[in-house]
């Protein structure tokens, strides 16, 4: 139920207005969302406090806006944090000068433990100075002035979690404010593995979703949802249940989305580039346009959704025959329930295709505790999950959430419980 999203618009700072927006989508944080400077990633950045305001367009969102005259003070690393049930979710991002001497290939890069990694910086200004590379503000290497290549590369064979961090490049005569940054995220586990011992196999996350090493869940890119991120959202929407909407004239253009690690940052589906302001080339789709359409039967490729399958066909390439998937819907759930203290058996009922299974239906208490069904049954059209609370008490009053997450998508429905 915890869906925290940080929108960095625009990470390359010129003389235009730039902002960070942190959204708690579909849940109410127990403490206010915070946006701050990430001194763990970069120590020597500006100390000035940030002017954090409420984003009036959304219920639970905070925003920092820098006017064009403040551009010189923006460079650095930032975080957004939300808390629920004592658990903190922190999302990190960076901003840098568009006029920096080097520019990163990507804002963040997520790799698996043991991967062979290349972190690249493109030289955009030629200077008669040594180039220097840092990690988290710590010096790594200098490249003599006459040997600075067009692409400055850091190569990490067999990447380890301790290699994670913010890598930066600049000329020695420069400083933090002329540096280019890229953040390397190294999953604690090897490819396709998760769990404390990394011995569980990840669900195949589609559309560039990333398997969380602690939970095994797919973190879906902006524009996709569901247990395996197979389901495309409606146009210009994002979030775990696709409830949030990009308000720009061209949808999510110029929105860099940052999600909790190990996802990092990417453009919304349909966009690419460091500023997420370049449309995908024909035949490509998805976050950063990294996915290639290979649609069967000559089906159309949409840059936002991928292959648009004819009725009766499904799958990323429209390769499977079958009934078209239907996003789950929660039905027959009142907005408000009054109960007496004692035993309580709330029911969540959902439709959709395929029908939600026992594991795909959960109930989230106001304190963030996730409950799994005690009983479960289904008819031709509905799945019914019955939960058991042995002793419900007045402090349990508040907003409870019925949550359904299947391959066909995700839906959450909040409802109020008053306990007498």
């Amino acid at each position: 139920a915890m869906d925290l999203i940080l929108i960095n618009s625009l990470p390359l700072v010129s003389d235009a207005e730039t902002s960070l927006t942190c959204i708690a989508s579909g849940w109410r944080p127990h403490e206010p969302i915070t946006i701050g400077r990430d001194f763990e990633a970069l120590m020597n950045q500006h100390q000035d406090p940030l002017e954090v305001t409420q984003d009036v367009t959304r219920e639970w969102a905070k925003k920092v806006v820098w006017k064009r005259e403040k551009a010189s003070k923006i460079n650095g690393a930032y975080f957004c944090e939300g808390r629920v049930r004592g658990e903190a979710i922190r999302i990190r991002t960076m901003k840098m000068r568009q006029q920096a001497s080097f520019l990163p290939a990507t804002l963040t890069m997520t790799v698996d433990k043991g991967d062979n990694v290349n972190i690249s910086f493109k030289k955009v200004l030629i200077k008669e100075e040594d180039a220097v590379i840092y990690k988290n503000g710590s010096f790594i290497h200098s490249v003599p002035r006459h040997e600075v290549p067009d692409i400055l590369e850091v190569h990490l064979p067999h990447a380890q979690p301790q290699d994670a961090g913010v890598y930066s490049a600049r000329y020695i005569g420069g400083n933090l404010f002329t540096s280019a940054f890229t953040r390397l995220i190294v999953r604690r586990c090897e490819a396709q593995k998760w769990g404390p011992e990394c011995n569980h196999l990840c669900t195949a996350c589609m559309n560039n979703g990333v398997c969380h090493e602690d939970t095994g869940e797919c973190i879906c890119p902006p524009g996709f949802m569901g247990r395996t991120c197979e389901k495309a959202c409606e146009l210009h929407t994002f979030g775990r249940t696709c409830k949030e909407r990009c308000s720009g004239q061209e949808g999510c253009k110029s929105y860099v989305f940052c999600l909790p690690d190990p996802y990092g940052c990417s453009c919304a589906t349909g966009w690419k580039g460091l500023q997420c302001n370049e449309a995908c080339h024909p035949g490509f789709y998805g976050p950063d346009c990294k996915l290639r359409c290979s649609c069967n039967n000559g089906e159309m490729c949409d840059r936002f959704q991928g292959c648009l399958c004819s009725p009766g066909w499904q799958g990323l390439q429209c390769e499977r025959e079958g009934i078209q998937r239907m996003t789950p819907k929660i039905v027959d759930l009142p907005d408000h329930i009054e109960v007496n203290s004692g035993k309580f058996n709330p029911i969540c009922k959902a439709s959709g295709w395929p029908l939600p299974t026992n594991e795909e239906m959960t109930l989230v208490k106001p304190d963030g505790t996730v409950l799994h069904p005690k009983d479960f049954n289904h008819t031709d059209h509905f799945s019914v999950a019955i939960f058991t609370i042995h002793r419900i008490l007045p402090p349990d009053s508040g907003v409870w959430v019925c949550s359904v997450n299947t391959v066909a998508g995700m839906v959450e429905k909040p409802f109020n419980i008053s306990v007498k």
Epitope: I133, G137, H141, L156, P157, H158, Q160
Partner: antibody, heavy 124, light 107 residues
Framework: EVQLVESGGGLVQPGGSLRLSCAAS????????IHWVRQAPGKGLEWVAA????????YYADSVKGRFTISADTSKNTAYLQMNSLRAEDTAVYYC?????????????????WGQGTLVTVSS | DIQMTQSPSSLSASVGDRVTITCRAS??????VAWYQQKPGKAPKLLIY???FLYSGVPSRFSGSGSGTDFTLTISSLQPEDFATYYC?????????FGQGTKVEIK
């Protein structure tokens, strides 16, 4: 546990040769540079050479260039220092040390683990 | 080659004293300076890297500062196990070079 163990030191006559070995364990050999650093009796530290087992890149101090050759065998997780045309001034304790590999041309000189050293004495 | 000049070459101090060792580079080395501790008959141990970053497992009484050409290692409260020789080293360029060492002795 990270370990670097040097061997092969001893007494050799001027003009002679010696081959030092550095056996590495407890870490991914190809993800690090291996360095040789020496220390003459009662003196300070002097860097000698470095190799990346990952790509075979090598660097040498001017004082040993052309006489010493650093190499590595990734199948044995071992680095070597072949020392030819030895001189009296090469007498020292030779340490092997490691540093994180960040790329072929990005030699990183912060050495976080060191072996216990092996003594090389060049004397007639 | 870049020269690293350490001062003093030796010093006497008591347990609990604050000790400062300085190191000067012959040219700008950014923050590419490491500090090592060496005890007689033992291998050097890394204390500080990148001028001010404390290496893992090193007590917080050790700290480093500086950038460009001037660098400092400080031991805030000298402990019996800190009596040793300390070396600075530039990791900016090939060849890496060490200072001549500072021997910290018991007063």
């Amino acid at each position: 546990e990270v370990q670097l163990v040097e061997s092969g030191g001893g007494l050799v006559q001027p003009g002679g040769s010696l081959r030092l070995s550095c056996a590495a364990s407890g870490f991914t050999f190809s993800s690090y540079w291996i360095h040789w650093v020496r220390q003459a009796p009662g003196k300070g530290l002097e860097w000698v050479a470095a190799i990346s087992p990952n790509d075979g890149s090598t660097y040498y101090a001017d004082s040993v260039k052309g006489r010493f050759t650093i190499s590595a065998d990734t199948s044995k997780n071992t680095a070597y220092l072949q020392m030819n045309s030895l001189r009296a001034e090469d007498t020292a304790v030779y340490y092997c040390a490691r540093s994180r590999y960040y790329g072929q041309r990005l030699v990183y000189y912060v050495m976080d683990y060191w072996g216990q050293g092996t003594l090389v004495t060049v004397s007639s | 080659d870049i020269q690293m000049t350490q001062s003093p070459s030796s010093l006497s101090a008591s347990v609990g004293d604050r000790v400062t060792i300085t190191c000067r580079a012959s040219q700008d080395v950014s923050t590419a300076v490491a500090w090592y501790q060496q005890k007689p008959g033992k291998a050097p141990k890394l204390l500080i890297y990148s001028a001010s970053f404390l290496y893992s497992g090193v007590p917080s009484r050790f700290s480093g500062s500086g950038s460009g050409t001037d660098f400092t290692l400080t031991i805030s409260s000298l402990q019996p196990e800190d009596f040793a020789t300390y070396y600075c080293q530039q990791s900016y360029t090939t060849p890496p070079t060490f200072g001549q060492g500072t021997k910290v002795e018991i007063k």
